[in-house]
Interface confidence: low
């Protein structure tokens, strides 16, 4: 290729090129100058650049760099944002279906427990949704509350239907008895284990995806240092000062400059790698009781089994509770 | 045992959101995401090279700019970058990351620690024969992973957890509605031997 033309005496080439960056302003010297005030594009001879032009080049270089960085991360950012949204929605759908299954189980198998059961189930699954989204709720408390609420209804509707409409005092006694007598056997503990493990993993999975977005957003909107701006200006624009419009930076030189500008960002690399590998490990383990889809969609069956367990032991329980909550019942009959 | 109800499927259409492919499950979608993320595992270390390859750089030209002058692309001067007497590249690296980058690194360290803590230990319940016996409440061992709900008679103590329901209720329309005898292909995302 022929060597580029020397800078023209009138700085015409440089001026017409610079006008594209900064229309209207007469910052380009009429003729090449010594350029002793320049800080970045230190000339070996006369130059067609001024201090003001240098500053504009630095600003443009940093903007270019930010745009390049954003386009570099666009695919990755879209991947995580899209998946975070899809999974969040999918998890909400799973919760909704799990609630529907559970409600249908009550409707089909224990119609006398509705609509109270619907209300308790609704509250439970609302808490599940909130927990997944990061609310500070204790899963054990959620499960306990579900069974505490269900038992008085089961007792008064299924085990002892002769009782008048339940009053608050017997309900409180029954709630207490529920735990003391382990009326549902080990089912509440089982559900606590399965639900807490699966929801913890789901929650951390969503948290991790959202942090992934935050990482990309952070590096996406980095403001590059003045030093970096100067290096970029030297690489991309200082050649213009000599009228060398068509030449491109040397490849090795570009890599050195970018590594300098990206030194801070590249420090994320180690933790980013670990993030992806740790996320992979988590995902590989998201099965059995660590898979909320599996656990929640099967919950109706376990709750059904727990009620059957109560019914199986109804005779023994009714006697024991009769004694335990006798005081409450007497007050209720008055 | 309780069965999948048929009268409360109000979400069938919206349910398909989680299915890009017709038989896709949440579990396969997660694995697909990880595979795609893994292609970005070197994203940050590769950034300098990526940006150079996406900005104007001399590739086929004989001459290139080294920051000070026009040089032959394969000469010693092309690699040297004329930064002497200006700002030291080493100093630039020694400054350390921006506060905002340090902050995000701390968050990554934290989430990585959480992810490692939460990761399920491998191979704990394999290669044991499934042996089950009825048990009373309180009979479920210290390891709650080993307890699953039975389908009626109390619960089961299971030495090997062997089930996995990897469906987002997708094939409920065909498979799980009671009394349905349609001809259909069984979904392989049913329960499976290892995942309960």
């Amino acid at each position: 290729q022929p060597p580029p033309p020397p800078p023209d005496a009138t700085c015409h080439q440089v001026r017409s090129f610079f006008q594209r960056l900064q229309p209207g302003l007469k910052w380009v010297p009429e003729t090449p100058v010594p350029g002793s005030d320049l800080q970045v594009c230190l000339p070996k001879g006369p130059t067609c650049c001024s201090r003001k032009m240098e500053e504009k080049y630095q600003l443009t270089a940093r903007l270019n760099m930010e745009q390049l960085l954003q386009s570099a991360s666009m695919e990755l950012k879209f991947l995580i944002i899209q998946n975070a949204a899809v999974f969040q929605e999918a998890f909400e759908i799973v919760v909704r279906h799990a609630k529907n299954y559970t409600n249908a189980m009550f409707k089909n198998n224990y119609p006398s427990l509705t609509p109270q059961a619907f209300e308790f189930v609704g509250e439970f699954f609302t808490d599940v949704s909130l927990y997944i989204l990061g609310s500070d709720i204790n899963v054990d408390d959620m499960v306990n509350e579900l069974f505490d609420s269900l038992f008085p209804v089961i007792y008064t509707q299924l085990m002892n239907p002769g009782l008048p409409d339940s009053a608050l005092d017997i309900n409180e006694c029954l709630r207490g008895a529920r735990r003391d007598l382990k009326v549902f056997g080990n089912f509440p503990k089982l559900i606590m284990t399965q639900v807490s493990k699966s929801l913890q993993v789901t929650r951390i999975f969503l948290q991790a995806l959202n942090l992934g977005i935050e990482v990309i957003n952070t590096t996406d909107h980095l403001k590059f240092s003045k030093d970096c701006g100067r290096m970029l200006t030297r690489m991309w624009y200082c050649s213009y000062c000599q009228g060398l419009m068509m030449v491109k930076p040397c490849g090795g030189y570009c890599n050195v400059v970018m590594q300098g500008c990206m030194a801070g960002v590249v420090e994320i690399d180690k933790y980013w790698r670990e993030y992806i590998l740790s996320l992979e490990e988590l995902v590989n383990g998201m099965y059995r009781i660590y898979d909320m889809e599996n656990v929640l969609l099967g919950l109706f069956s376990t709750i059904h089994d727990s009620i059957q367990y109560v019914q199986k032991n109804a005779g023994k329980l009714t006697t024991t509770i009769g004694k335990l909550c006798a005081h409450s019942q007497q007050r209720q009959y008055r | 045992s309780a069965y999948y109800p048929e009268d409360l499927f109000i979400d069938k259409k919206v349910l398909k959101v989680a299915h890009v492919e017709h038989e896709e499950t949440l579990s396969s979608r997660r694995r697909e995401l990880i595979q795609k993320l893994k292609s970005f595992i070197s994203f940050y270390s590769a950034l300098p090279g990526y940006i150079c390859s996406h900005s104007p750089v001399a590739e086929n030209d004989t001459l290139c700019w080294n920051g000070q002058e026009l040089v032959e692309r394969y000469s010693q001067k092309a690699a040297r970058n004329g930064m002497k007497n200006q700002f030291n590249l080493h100093e630039l690296k020694m400054k350390g990351p921006e506060p905002v980058v340090s902050q995000i690194i701390d968050k990554l360290k934290h989430i990585n620690q959480l992810l490692r803590t939460m990761s399920v230990p491998k191979g704990r319940v394999l290669d044991k024969n499934l042996d089950e016996e009825g048990f009373e409440s309180g009979d479920c061992g210290d390891d709650e992973d080993e307890c699953i709900g039975g389908s009626g008679d109390g619960m089961m103590k299971v030495k090997n957890q062997l089930r996995f329901l990897a469906e987002l209720a997708y094939d409920l329309d065909v498979d799980d509605v009671p009394g349905n005898n349609q001809q259909a292909t069984p979904k392989d995302n049913e329960i499976s031997t290892f995942h309960n």
């Epitope: - | 045992s1 394999l126 499934l130 062997l162 049913e190 329960i191 499976s192 031997t193 290892f194």
Partner: antibody, heavy 115, light 112 residues
């Protein structure tokens, strides 16, 4: 189309080992368990074990008391079943089958054990 | 291990007549997710087994509608409404809920 293609027939001496392969195609190998079932001449079907290629998890029929090892190579979408300390009663056709319901089976591999 | 018991072991049938095979499991095959994991297979002479019915009553694609499955818990039945010559072979029931998975001894269907 899902296909499972097994390795050819083998003749082995008692005490030796045999390794049967099953190459899968037409689906994502890592996503589905591969099971192994055998059938002695004129006899019924007997489940031997399974592997989940994605996680490497395995499950075995304890009747084989550690003689069977099932592995999978994700890069070639191939599952393997190795049976060691062969005896004459191990003479059978060995099938691989994809879970769930074994809707897809290999063509079978005849393993003959004789002195 | 769960024992799967099939009856009869041999079933001579006249073409066009119905046939019925029974399968009993030593334990309930109902899983806690509500599904019952019982399958029926047909193994034609010299071939690999082929799936007919999964989850008690669901016909696999391509299986003629003369085949139907029924039952619950521990007792299951495979019915062929009108036997055809191509239906000869050994029929197996199988459970895939407890490891080790097990099969019935097989029922040999032959044309009289």
């Amino acid at each position: 189309e899902v296909q499972l293609v097994q390795s050819g027939a083998e003749v082995k001496k008692p005490g030796a080992s045999v390794k049967v392969s099953c190459k899968a195609s037409g689906y994502t190998f890592s996503d589905y368990e591969m099971h192994w079932v055998r059938q002695a001449p004129g006899q019924g079907l007997e489940w031997m074990g399974a592997i989940h290629p994605g996680s490497g998890d395995t499950a075995y029929n304890q009747r084989f008391k550690g003689r069977v090892t099932i592995t999978a190579d994700k890069s070639t979408s191939t599952a393997y079943m190795e049976l060691s300390s062969l005896r004459s009663e191990d003479t059978a056709v060995y099938y691989c089958a994809r879970f769930y319901s074994y809707a897809y089976w290999g063509q079978g591999t005849l393993v003959t054990v004789s002195a | 291990d769960i024992v799967m018991t099939q009856t009869p072991l041999s079933l001579p049938v006249i073409t066009g007549e119905p046939a019925s095979i029974s399968c009993r499991s030593s334990q309930s095959l109902v899983h806690s997710n509500g599904n019952t994991y019982l399958q029926w297979y047909l193994q034609k002479p010299g071939q690999s087994p082929q799936l007919l019915i999964y989850k008690v009553s669901n016909r696999f694609s391509g299986v003629p509608d003369r085949f139907s499955g029924s039952g619950s818990g521990t007792d299951f039945t495979l019915k062929i409404s009108r036997v055809e010559a191509e239906d000869v072979g050994v029929y197996y029931c199988s459970q895939s809920i407890y490891v080790p998975y097990t099969f019935g001894q097989g029922t040999k269907l032959e044309i009289k």
